[in-house]
């Protein structure tokens, strides 16, 4: 996160860290807890690393440097990448992770509410992006979970800023015209959440941007409301019943 500040314990209890353990262990992406056994993240996090057993999912943590060999983590039972996601495109950058064992909810580990299907009428004015990603373009992973308040921008405005890309209705953009605050490398898959009527909702999944926090280059997020049917279908068909936070 560029231009952010340290988060507090329990402030974003749905935020998880997706880490890979090969020779060493490292944080690669963020994700959002949406049910006892489900994490929502970005499909591109698994490009080149589709093997379930190399991944470790840490929930209920604030500081990555607190993780030791004894820190509990979740393992993956199943990775469900959107069927229309292609490595050659930026579309449908969404994936579900089914955990091997369900998580108990605590003050520091609980799910985020999902939006209503096709939610286009709600005007969100209080939106935040969180993650342990770089604090500048050529930076490094941060130890303490960062947060930053960023306004949504219209898709029309976003398309003007990204003429060389197709900004679809299944994407949502956020950023300041002058730049300075944004998600960055390592924040992928993490949440863009907005507070509306006293409730936090998962509006976007951190997907991509041209650099980080550049002027007139907003961050682009997968619009969760556009994938509610897919999320419900996959979580229900895998579980028999949906085990996740009901849409707001």
């Amino acid at each position: 996160i560029v231009g952010g500040t340290n988060s507090s314990w329990g402030e974003w209890p749905w935020q998880v860290s997706l880490q890979v353990k090969l020779t060493a262990q490292r944080h690669l992406c963020g994700g959002s807890l949406i049910g006892h056994q489900w994490v929502l993240t970005a499909a591109h996090c698994f490009d080149g690393l589709p093997l379930q057993d190399v991944w470790r999912i840490y929930s209920g943590i604030l500081n990555l440097s607190d993780i030791t060999k004894d820190t509990p983590f979740s393992q993956i039972k199943e990775i469900i990448i959107h069927q229309n996601y292609k490595v050659s495109e930026g579309n449908h950058d969404i994936a579900l992770i089914k955990l091997q064992a369900p998580l108990n909810y605590t003050e520091f580990q609980k799910p985020i509410c999902l939006p209503s299907k096709g939610d286009t009428s709600t005007i969100y004015t209080n939106c935040w992006v969180t993650g342990w990603g770089f604090s500048k373009e050529k930076g490094e992973i941060q130890n303490i979970l960062q947060k930053v308040n960023i306004p949504l921008v219209t898709n029309e405005e976003c398309q003007k800023r990204y003429q060389d890309y197709k900004i679809t209705q299944r994407m949502v953009c956020a950023g300041y015209k002058e730049g300075g605050k944004d998600a960055c490398k390592g924040d992928s898959g993490g949440p863009l959440v907005c507070k509306h009527n006293g409730m936090w909702r998962l509006v976007g999944i951190t997907s991509w941007g041209e650099g980080c926090a550049r002027r007139e280059q907003p961050g682009v997020y997968t619009k969760v409301a556009e994938y509610m049917d897919w999320i419900l279908e996959k979580t229900q068909s895998s579980d028999g019943k949906a085990q996740m936070q009901s849409p707001a």
Partner: antibody
Framework: EVQLLESGGGLVQPGGSLRLSCAAS????????MTWVRQAPGKGLEWVSY????????IYADSVKGRFTISRDNSKNTLYLQMNSLRAEDTAVYYC??????????????????WGQGTLVTVSS | DIQMTQSPGTLSLSPGERATLSCRTS???????LAWYQQTPGQAPRLLIY???SRATGIPDRFSGTGYGTDFTLTISRLEPEDYGTYYC?????????FGQGTRVEIK
């Protein structure tokens, strides 16, 4: 299956004009940046021009700027290259290519993942 | 403009040998925008590597790419008969997009 098929090449005199076409199929053409690349006989590859998915943004190599115009018709899934004021040094095989732009570590990638078979343009008197 | 310099110009190797091709750029290139292509005579180029190190669909794992900044490498671990041809690196980090002049890999 992704396919790109160029046409319109041929022999033209110096100062003449030619319009190349590239018919695309097997993918959502309107979502992709498209590009032209050329290769003079026995030489390496040279990037010529690209056009944004909507067609509203175009960029050219200095060697063709002001003489060549790239365009597209998304309703016909076709890419074009209008070549005017042709010179002997424009003689080459012209390839159209799709520019794939995936996502890696919250940035986009950029690579020419599918190419046409090429069409030969010969500029000679 | 970003100049791309490939070396060596020609590489003469036997099947089964390892090929190491270098590509140096005159300015910093974001790795996400560095690709390698293979071209055999009479054929269109074929994408091998993108993002400096990711193999394109259907490319065998004997091909690998590495590098960062201004120094990039394509390695073919064990040459197969179908690997002979010309290899190009290309950047689309900044316009004008540019290719290297190519490295020809020929049978020794």
């Amino acid at each position: 299956e992704v396919q790109l098929l160029e046409s319109g090449g041929g022999l033209v005199q110096p100062g003449g004009s030619l319009r190349l076409s590239c018919a695309a199929s097997g993918f959502t053409f309107s979502h992709y940046l498209m590009t032209w690349v050329r290769q003079a006989p026995g030489k390496g590859l040279e990037w010529v021009s690209y056009i944004s998915p909507s067609g509203g943004h175009t960029i050219y190599a200095d060697s063709v700027k002001g003489r060549f115009t790239i365009s597209r018709d998304n309703s016909k899934n076709t890419l074009y290259l209008q070549m005017n004021s042709l010179r002997a040094e424009d003689t080459a095989v012209y390839y159209c290519a799709r520019v794939a732009r995936g996502i890696a570590a919250r940035s986009r990638t950029s690579q020419f993942d599918y190419w046409g078979q090429g069409t030969l343009v010969t500029v000679s008197s | 403009d970003i100049q791309m310099t490939q070396s060596p110009g020609t590489l003469s190797l036997s099947p089964g040998e390892r090929a190491t091709l270098s590509c140096r750029t005159s300015q910093f290139v974001n790795s996400n925008y560095l690709a390698w292509y293979q071209q055999t005579p009479g054929q269109a180029p074929r994408l091998l590597i993108y993002g400096a190190s990711s193999r394109a669909t259907g490319i065998p794992d004997r091909f690998s790419g590495t590098g960062y900044g201004t120094d990039f490498t394509l390695t073919i671990s064990r040459l197969e008969p179908e690997d002979y041809g010309t290899y190009y690196c290309q950047q689309s980090s900044r316009t004008p997009w540019t290719f290297g002049q190519g490295t020809r890999v020929e049978i020794k």
